[in-house]
């Protein structure tokens, strides 16, 4: 919908979770609402309770199974409805046909670690979490490094246009504290978006050796 005040947006993490946000100006704060998922070719259906995340926005996670189980495929369509209680009955507030692999947002990368650090460079690795085997190598990453005296928003983005779960940061300043974050995105999906940023990894470059050029 073009109207930004009222939206029902959901993303699939590629395995067993559909996360939804429902925003609605003027909606009643104390009304009980839920998201109901009905797949077109599966025997299960699932419901989650919408909980407030701001004054006019609610969110919930449809847990479809064990975290690493592949619950949906590229041919699945899931009808998602927002239902709110009105007295003794439930009223449909919003509806959409959700194509999971057109609306992907993966989990943030995990297990960030410093593989090797020197005075001017640092090699960092990470892992992707709960990502479908369907992607094979069709993933890309963005990374950013927080330098002293700067904000994350000012940090330049480094783009890795392939499934590469490591990076070598160069031209760093010796004996300096940095933080590093990475996020991931599948190449598939018309409405696919970047994962959240990973938890920041703090590291410090080695001090320059005394009496040597830096």
């Amino acid at each position: 919908a073009v109207n930004g005040t009222s939206q029902f947006t959901c993303f699939y993490n590629s395995r067993a979770n559909i996360s939804c946000v429902w925003s609605q100006d003027g909606a009643l704060q104390d009304t009980s609402c839920q998201v109901h998922a009905w797949p077109d070719r599966r025997r299960w259906n699932q419901t989650c309770e919408l909980l407030p995340v701001s004054q006019a926005s609610w969110a919930c996670n449809l847990i479809l199974g064990a975290p690493d189980s592949q619950k949906l495929t590229t041919v699945d369509i899931v009808t998602l409805r927002v239902l709110c209680r009105e007295g003794v009955r439930w009223r449909v507030m919003a509806i959409q046909d959700f194509k999971p692999f057109e609306n992907l947002r993966l989990m943030a990368p995990i297990s960030l670690q410093v593989v090797h650090v020197e005075t001017h460079r640092c090699n960092i690795s990470w892992e992707i979490s709960q990502a479908s085997h369907y992607f094979e190598r069709h993933l890309e990453f963005e990374a950013r490094t927080l330098s002293p005296g700067h904000t994350w928003e000012e940090a330049p983005l480094l783009t890795l246009k392939q499934k590469q779960e490591w990076i070598c940061l160069e031209t760093l300043t010796p004996d300096t504290q940095y933080e590093f974050q990475v996020r991931v995105k599948p190449l598939q999906g018309e409405f696919t978006t970047w994962s959240p940023w990973s938890q920041p990894l703090a590291f410090r470059t080695k001090p320059a050796a005394l009496g040597k050029d830096t």
Epitope: A1, Q7, F8, T9, W38, D40, I77, Q96, D97, F191
Partner: nanobody, 123 residues
Framework: EVQLVESGGGLVQVGDSLRLSCAAS????????MGWFRQAPGKEREFVAV????????VYADSVKGRFTISRDNAKNTVYLDMSSLKPDDTAVYYC????????????????WGKGTLVTVSS
């Protein structure tokens, strides 16, 4: 952009049936929610029914449940509203509308609208 053109309106008697059609065109039609709304003279526009394009899932206003049926023909890019047991209260201009991604959180809010077709139910 989605273009919508309604047809099928006219003058009918109480208890009669009528079929409205909405021809849709545009790049995003295949993933849209398609709805029918109506506006009676001197009243606000109200939601009648909506259908999802891919699975054909439907939602109806209480006032038309059991009397009106919304359907779609994907091959023809057309949405229909079959109206039966018509009452004088059903007299209104009927509008076809489309909701495209990101989807609306409110059945009354749509992105694209047709110009409408008049249905008059006389007693």
């Amino acid at each position: 952009e989605v273009q919508l053109v309604e047809s099928g309106g006219g003058l009918v008697q109480v208890g009669d049936s009528l079929r409205l059609s909405c021809a849709a065109s545009g790049r995003t039609v295949g993933s849209a929610n398609m709805g029918w709304f109506r506006q009676a003279p001197g009243k606000e526009r109200e939601f009648v029914a909506v259908i999802t394009w891919s699975t054909g899932s439907t939602v109806y206003a209480d006032s038309v449940k059991g009397r009106f049926t919304i359907s779609r023909d994907n091959a023809k890019n057309t949405v229909y509203l079959d109206m039966s047991s018509l009452k004088p209260d059903d007299t209104a201009v009927y509008y076809c509308a489309a909701d495209v991604y990101p989807y609306s959180g409110n059945l009354n809010i749509m992105d694209y609208w047709g110009k409408g077709t008049l249905v008059t139910v006389s007693s």
